[in-house]
């Protein structure tokens, strides 16, 4: 707590300007009116105050707005935002995308801090859903943002927002997240023609079920191995050799290099060796000829 001392004669701040730069801690406390500070927050950003001085300015705003800052102040916090705690931010009601952008700009280039995470959470909850403009903004600043959300949080993403998602935004998503995003993407891109559809849906395919992969295999899509390796194992296993060959097109040769890795390894174990041999890639580990394959899961379901 800063001691309450009288402002020295002639030092009372009439506006927030560079004359304050060398004010001591107690002088700032005594000579800068909190209401003046609130109305001229945008000027603070142009003055490279020390961190001690910023602490005093924050303290003044905290006293003026104990229930949380109004958005008119929040939008102009600039680098004073870096002084805010998640507890401070939880008191805010941020509704404007411009305010969100202004504060994310301050944190640009940094990893997502607890302050930023809290700000985004408050903003998205206030909007009720993760709309396209918000998603556009967030992924522009934090490409990994989408994959930091839980499947439950992702369920609030409307299909229309999927248009804002870039392939790199999904790099760190796990299968559970892609399971939620894939149906939304399928819905969002449903009116596109074959090749355009595949380009858009490709990065979401880690959430695709078997029947959709079968359908894609009929469309000459030439899926690359990197995409194939990200598919759900349980979705790949039921595919026939012919379907995988059609799905991968010229990329089918890449299976040899991946034969020890999932999902290729598990898929090979489910295929007849005869069928694998038709690929001419030397893939080994299929079911020997003459062996009967019993699907025990099917048998259990029938009984």
């Amino acid at each position: 707590e800063v001691e309450k001392t009288a402002c020295p004669s002639g030092k009372k701040a009439r506006e927030i300007d560079e004359s304050l730069i060398f004010y001591k801690k107690w002088e700032l406390e005594a000579c800068v009116d909190a209401a003046l500070l609130a109305t001229q927050m945008d000027r603070v950003n142009a003055i490279p105050f020390t961190y001690e001085q910023l602490d005093v300015l924050k303290h003044k705003l905290d006293e003026l707005y104990p229930q949380g800052y109004p958005e008119s102040v929040i939008q102009h916090l600039g680098y004073l935002f870096l002084k805010m705690s998640p507890e401070d931010i939880r008191k805010w009601n941020v509704t404007s995308l411009e305010t969100l952008k202004a504060l994310l700009e301050v944190n640009k280039g940094h990893e997502m801090s607890p302050q930023v995470a809290t700000l985004i959470d408050r903003f998205v909850k206030g909007r009720g859903q993760l709309d396209k403009d918000t998603l556009d903004t967030l992924t522009a600043f934090y490409p990994g943002y989408l994959c930091s959300l839980s499947p439950e949080e992702l369920s609030s993403v409307p299909p229309s927002s999927i248009w804002a998602v870039r392939p790199q935004d999904l790099d760190t998503c796990d299968p559970r997240q892609l399971d939620v995003l894939y149906p939304k993407a399928r819905l969002a891109f449903q009116n596109m023609n074959g090749s355009e559809y595949f380009v858009k849906i490709q990065s979401f395919l880690g959430g695709a079920p078997t029947e959709d992969l079968k359908a894609l295999s009929q469309q000459n899509v030439s899926m690359d191995l990197a995409t194939f390796m990200k598919l759900r194992t349980d979705a790949v296993l039921p595919l026939t050799v012919a379907e995988v060959q059609k799905l991968l097109g010229p990329h089918v040769e890449g299976l040899k290099a991946e034969e020890r890795h999932r999902p290729v390894r598990d898929w090979i174990l489910r295929q007849r060796q005869d069928d694998l041999d038709t690929l001419g890639l030397g893939l080994q580990g299929g079911i020997p000829n003459g062996y009967l394959v019993l699907d025990l899961s099917m048998q259990e379901a029938l009984s």
Partner: antibody, heavy 120, light 107 residues
Framework: QVQLVQSGGGLVKPGGSLRLSCAAS????????MSWIRQAPGKGLEWVSY????????YYADSVKGRFTISRDNAKNSLYLQMNSLRAEDTAVYYC?????????????WGQGTLVTVSS | EIVMTQSPATLSLSPGERATLSCRAS??????LAWYQQKPGQAPRLLIY???NRATGIPARFSGSGSGTDFTLTISSLEPEDFAVYYC?????????FGGGTKVEIK
């Protein structure tokens, strides 16, 4: 790109004067506070002087107060350090540096440095 | 004024080794700390600011940590170009001061 190019160093006798210049390019010079920082041979860094974006607010280290004058000409994108009554202990490489603005306030970038040698 | 003390004065290491540099402030400075790198005959350049944020173009092998009075700069695996002098600086209050520097030299 953002650049600070210095000139004006040299050899001067004790009690003499010297003027250092720092020409800025690649950024809006008039938005930024600027500093002079010096480094005596084989020693660390010492913050010498500071000037606000408009030039109206100035700071000097106690070691140079009353002898050095910092100034700027925003129309010419230039920063200056007028050094009078020079002493042997002022011998150093002098750097101009831009202060941060709006996002983070640290010295970045720095000029290439100019050597000032005070010796009889 | 706040006095910044760096240790060790010299660190002798081989390329590939991990370097740990220390900086201590004479009073608490929160997260108001930056690190600069200076190579012989060159100006210092900003490396890390606000304790842990890498400046533009600085490789990920450089990282900063600490708060209050004790701070650390870590170079996870030294590259030949990392052998230089490193300075810490605070921006907590006026005047701004630098540490005396730590020289990282090849063993």
């Amino acid at each position: 790109q953002v650049q600070l190019v210095q000139s004006g160093g040299g050899l001067v006798k004790p009690g003499g004067s010297l003027r250092l210049s720092c020409a800025a390019s690649g950024f809006t010079f008039s938005d930024y506070y600027m500093s002079w920082i010096r480094q005596a041979p084989g020693k660390g860094l010492e913050w010498v002087s500071y000037i606000s974006s408009s030039g109206s607010t100035i700071y000097y280290a106690d070691s140079v107060k009353g002898r050095f004058t910092i100034s700027r000409d925003n129309a010419k994108n230039s920063l200056y350090l007028q050094m009078n009554s020079l002493r042997a202990e002022d011998t150093a490489v002098y750097y101009c540096a831009r202060d941060g603005y709006r996002t983070h306030n640290w010295f970045d970038p720095w000029g290439q440095g100019t050597l000032v040698t005070v010796s009889s | 004024e706040i006095v910044m003390t760096q240790s060790p004065a010299t660190l002798s290491l081989s390329p590939g080794e991990r370097a740990t540099l220390s900086c201590r402030a004479s009073q608490s400075i929160g997260n108001s700390l930056a690190w600069y790198q200076q190579k012989p005959g060159q100006a210092p350049r900003l490396l890390i600011y606000d304790v842990s944020n890498r400046a533009t173009g600085i490789p990920a092998r450089f990282s900063g940590s600490g708060s209050g009075t004790d701070f650390t700069l870590t170079i996870s695996s030294l590259e030949p170009e990392d052998f230089a002098v490193y300075y810490c600086q605070h921006r907590y209050s006026w005047p701004l001061t630098f540490g005396g520097g730590t020289k990282v030299e090849i063993k």
